[in-house]
């Protein structure tokens, strides 16, 4: 009879066991386990009539289709085999162990005692079939096994062939190089990858395989297994396979689509193909005169560009349009997008006047291209270039003409200062005890006329101030200060103000520059009780042409002491000009009494001491300050008047060859101006240079080397 | 012909304010000075400051610093004279009058309580 | 401040004849620059705004008639009526301008 066994072990023991088992006997144990396991069976105990291979009573081991053992006897011979210590082990998970005893025992024989038991099955060890073996990675567990995949690859449902995800490759660029997964390592199993190259309509692609050509092939079938296959819109080329590469393949198409098929066995190579977009040849391109194409190349294709240049110091002119450089293209039907263009020479085309300057050419004609070469220079004896520059500009590559110092900026022409165009002379007769000066004497002396509207009538003075650039008059704060109200100190409106330069006769205004004020600055600590800070500045509305009657006086060096005791100096002035003339005198005859004709007068400086004590010594309350010098004659005869107010006391600069304005004429004693004792003050310009040049905006560094040759 | 006409009559309590009003036409308002001056009942005339309508600038009599305030509209030509702080001696005529030369008819404050 | 002083305070003189005011500044009232006296004189009527005579001391304002002038310089001023009409009667000031403008305390004048 037969016993089904399940369990996952268990005994066996011979019928009647452990006593004699019966003749004629015949009983069959089915042993079944879970998959993924095998029986293990061995024997504790076994004792069998002996035969001659087992034909009498035997115990028999077997699965669906094999013998795994036949067992008889009480020990081992060589014709019968007993189990011993052996262990059967079963292939799979059943097992069938059939006992047979015969129709005769001659002695008693106590049978067999027989234990089984399920063992797992290592299947990563054991699985030599590459139908049923993981492709990469195998994992055991007791009862079974499970495949996984290396990274980038994906276990394909048959839970065994690691494929790859590649049906998603585009190729847009005009060349390009695609391999099957893994090139030159064994393709993936089980995989269907898809290559597309999509160009750009015009180009056509080329194919050609490279290298390693090894796809899985059979020697009857063609490519049945694994192959490649490209698409080129209906057409199908392929099947390709096997170790013969393919010819080179002209699509005559802009799209293409590679199938790449592979089952889920076999070790190949694979294989690797290089593509090239091609398209309609351009007509040979020449450069154009003085100037070259990049990249060059004996043939130009569709979507080929080409940049066009010229040499340093030429323009690409396309359609009367210059530019650095253009671009053409090589389109699909196999001509150019634009004819070539030239090559002109860079014109820098007329310089920039020069404010005060004049402009030559070095080249001849008068040429403005490339290379060309012009000077600027400044109007002289009036002007000079600031900082020596040459002057020499060079027409660039870039069409902008060029100095080595100033880059493309402009020189500037500045003011000559402190050099009249006929020189003072040296005797100077002993404006009150004056003399008429010469045009062009005094060419920075200017008249300032206030007319101030605002009061009901209006008031009308003048005074004089000093030309320090173009734009700039220097003066005392007093002149342009409101008359009326003392006790504040309010600037006169700029419109209430005239500036009259290159003046000689007042009566004749007409060879002279009358300019209107753009701003009035008084000194912010201009103090009216004492005339200190007595300064002030008047920009221009417009600045004025320089020439032999309007130039500037140069600025002193920042010098506290200001000038030296007994020095000469010069101040000019359209003042009362008439000592004996006096106040009364003045009020009733109006302005008669101004001088018609410019007047000056030379005047040394006087030792401080003296001049505070002079004052001092007065009835009054005077104050000569650190801000002022007094200048004049202890006997008296020449002084600075009323209507000289604001002008300049200028000393000869020896170092510099100019005249310098250290003074502006301020204010003066009690008496008549000239008399004995009575000692002019004047504004000590040198304590404000700093002032000056701030409020003219500009640093002292850039006029100072004027004054400090 | 140059005008000045100035507002009417005012009547305050001590510690008010007052706010008198001139109206200039004939010239141009911007570019003279506006002065204002006082005159009690049976008094001579007392000069309190003025303002240049153009640019806002301002000269006050030391005795009215801190109490005047004056102010100018060009768009209307109308100058302003406001004193705070009023006491019964601060009743009389206030006059404005362009620079030297032309008044307005005058406005009488009456300072009391 | 500068300090103004008229006299007399009032003064009575006939149809016809002469007035003469004085008035005197405690300051120089000559600005230098200008060349001016900063004085002006004012006539004032009962019950209307001062009326200007005189500016910078001697000049007449356009429609004051040639009997009025003024004269001086520096701190004495004086204002004369040559021959007083009826409608001369009134009050008369003098205002410097020189500084913060400051007015003299007025002379009255009368028929006699």
């Known amino acids: 009879h037969t016993v089904e066994l399940n369990n996952m072990f268990g005994q066996i023991q011979s019928p009647g066991y452990p006593d004699s088992y019966p003749s004629d006997s015949e009983v069959t144990w089915n042993i079944t386990v879970p998959d993924g396991f095998r029986i293990k069976l061995y024997f504790m105990h076994f004792n069998l009539e002996s035969s001659y291979l087992c034909e009498y009573d035997y115990v028999k081991v077997e699965t669906e289709d094999q013998v795994l053992a036949t067992f008889c006897g009480r020990e081992t011979t060589d014709t019968e085999q007993t189990p011993g210590q052996e262990v059967v082990l079963s292939p799979g998970s059943f097992m069938s162990i059939t006992f047979r005893s015969d129709f005769s025992n001659e002695e008693r024989f106590t049978g067999f005692d027989a234990h089984y038991m399920a063992v797992d099955v290592d299947e990563c060890k054991e699985r030599e079939d590459e139908e049923l073996s993981c492709d990469h990675y195998c994992h055991n567990y007791i009862g079974g096994y499970y495949c996984s995949c290396r990274f980038g690859y994906i276990l394909h449902t048959d839970n065994r062939t690691c494929r790859v995800e590649c049906s998603d490759n585009l190729f847009t660029q005009r060349t390009g190089v695609i391999t099957s997964p893994d090139f030159p390592n064994p393709y993936p199993k089980s995989s269907e990858c898809l290559y597309t190259i999509e160009l750009e309509e015009g180009f056509m692609v080329n194919l050609q395989f490279e290298d390693i050509f090894d796809i899985e092939d059979h020697p009857e079938v063609p490519c049945p297994y694994d192959y490649i296959k490209i698409k080129v819109g209906p057409k199908v080329l392929g099947p390709f396979c096997g170790e013969k590469a393919p010819e080179p393949i002209s699509t005559q198409s802009h799209s293409v689509l590679i199938l790449f098929h592979s089952d889920n066995s076999g070790e190949n190579r694979g294989w690797r193909l290089s593509y090239r977009a091609a398209g309609n040849e351009c007509p040979e391109l020449q450069p154009p005169v003085h100037g070259k194409i990049e990249p060059s190349q004996a043939k130009y294709f569709f979507k080929d560009q080409v940049l066009v240049s010229c040499d340093t110091g030429y323009k690409v002119l396309k359609d009367n349009v210059e530019m650095d450089t253009f671009q053409i293209e090589c389109l699909k039907d196999g001509t150019w997008s634009n004819k070539i263009p030239t090559c002109k020479i860079v014109d820098c085309r007329a310089p920039g006047e020069l404010e005060h300057g004049l402009i030559t050419f070095s080249t001849r004609n008068n040429l403005t291209t490339y290379k060309s070469e012009i000077k600027y220079s400044c109007q002289e004896p009036y002007y000079k270039m600031l900082n020596n520059n040459t002057g020499i500009y060079t027409c660039s590559a870039q069409g902008v003409w060029m100095n080595k110092v100033l880059g493309r900026s402009l020189p500037t022409c500045l003011p000559e200062c402190g050099q009249p165009s006929r020189s003072l002379p040296s005797l100077v007769k002993r404006i009150i005890g004056g003399r008429n000066a010469e045009p062009g004497l005094f060419p920075w002396q200017a008249l300032i006329v206030v007319e101030d509207t605002s009061r009901v009538p209006n008031d009308k003075w003048f005074g004089s101030g000093a030309l320090l650039s173009a734009s700039w008059i220097l003066t005392a704060a007093h002149v342009l200060r409101s008359q009326r109200r003392d006790t504040t100190v309010i600037p006169v409106s700029k419109e209430h103000v005239t500036v009259y330069l290159g003046l000689h006769d007042v009566r004749d205004k007409s060879g002279a520059v009358n300019s209107s004020a753009a701003r009035v600055v008084l000194h912010p600590d201009f103090n009216i009780q004492n005339y200190n800070h007595d300064i002030a500045l008047v920009q221009l509305q417009e600045p004025v042409p320089l020439g032999p009657h309007v130039m500037p006086v140069c600025l002193p060096r920042l010098e506290p002491e200001g000038p030296a005791p007994h020095m000469l100096g010069l101040v000019a002035g359209w003042g009362i000009s008439n000592p004996n003339v006096t106040v009364d005198e003045i009020i009733s005859s109006g302005t008669r009494t101004l001088s018609d004709v410019l007047q000056y007068v030379k005047l040394p400086v006087v030792p401080h001491a003296e001049c505070k004590t002079s004052y001092e010594s007065r009835s009054g309350n005077y104050s000569v300050t650190e801000n002022m010098f007094c200048a004049g004659y202890y006997e008296g005869g020449k002084d600075t008047c009323l209507g000289d107010s604001g002008g300049a006391f200028v000393i000869f600069d020896d170092l510099s060859q100019r005249w310098v304005v250290q003074g502006l004429v301020s204010w003066g004693g009690p008496e008549e101006c000239g008399s004995k004792q009575v000692y002019g003050v004047y504004t000590k310009v040198s304590n404000y240079v700093d002032w000056v040049w701030e409020q003219m905006g500009l640093p002292q560094s850039v006029v100072e080397p004027q004054v400090e040759r | 012909q140059v005008q000045l006409v100035q507002s009417g009559a005012e009547v305050k309590k001590p510690g008010a304010s007052v706010k008198v009003s001139c109206k200039a036409s004939g010239y141009t308002f911007t570019g003279k000075w506006i002065e204002w001056v006082r005159q009690a009942p049976g008094q001579g005339l007392e000069w309190i400051g003025e303002?240049?309508?153009?640019?806002?600038?301002?000269n006050y009599n030391e005795k009215f610093k801190g109490r005047a305030t004056f102010t100018a509209d060009s768009s209307t030509s109308t100058a302003y004279m406001e004193l705070s702080s009023l006491r019964s001696e601060d009743t009389a005529v206030y006059y404005c009058?362009?620079?030297?030369?032309?008044w307005g008819q005058g406005t009488l404050v009456t300072v009391s309580s | 401040d500068i300090v103004m002083t008229q006299s007399p305070d009032s003064l009575a003189v006939s149809l016809g004849e002469r007035a003469t005011i004085n008035c005197k500044s405690s300051q120089s009232l000559l600005a230098s620059r200008t060349r001016k006296n900063y004085l002006a004189w004012y006539q004032q009527k009962p019950g209307q705004p001062p009326k200007l005579l005189i500016y910078w001391a001697s000049t007449r304002e356009s429609g004051v008639p040639d009997r009025f002038s003024g004269s001086g310089s520096g701190t004495d001023f004086t204002l004369t009526i040559s021959s007083l009409q009826a409608e001369d009667v009134a009050v008369y000031y003098c205002?410097?301008?020189?500084?913060?403008?400051?007015f003299g305390q007025g002379t009255k004048v009368e028929i006699k």
């Open positions: 205002k410097q301008s020189y500084n913060i403008p400051t």
């Open positions: 009058l362009r620079s030297e030369d032309v």
């Open positions: 303002i240049l309508p153009g640019t806002g600038s301002t």
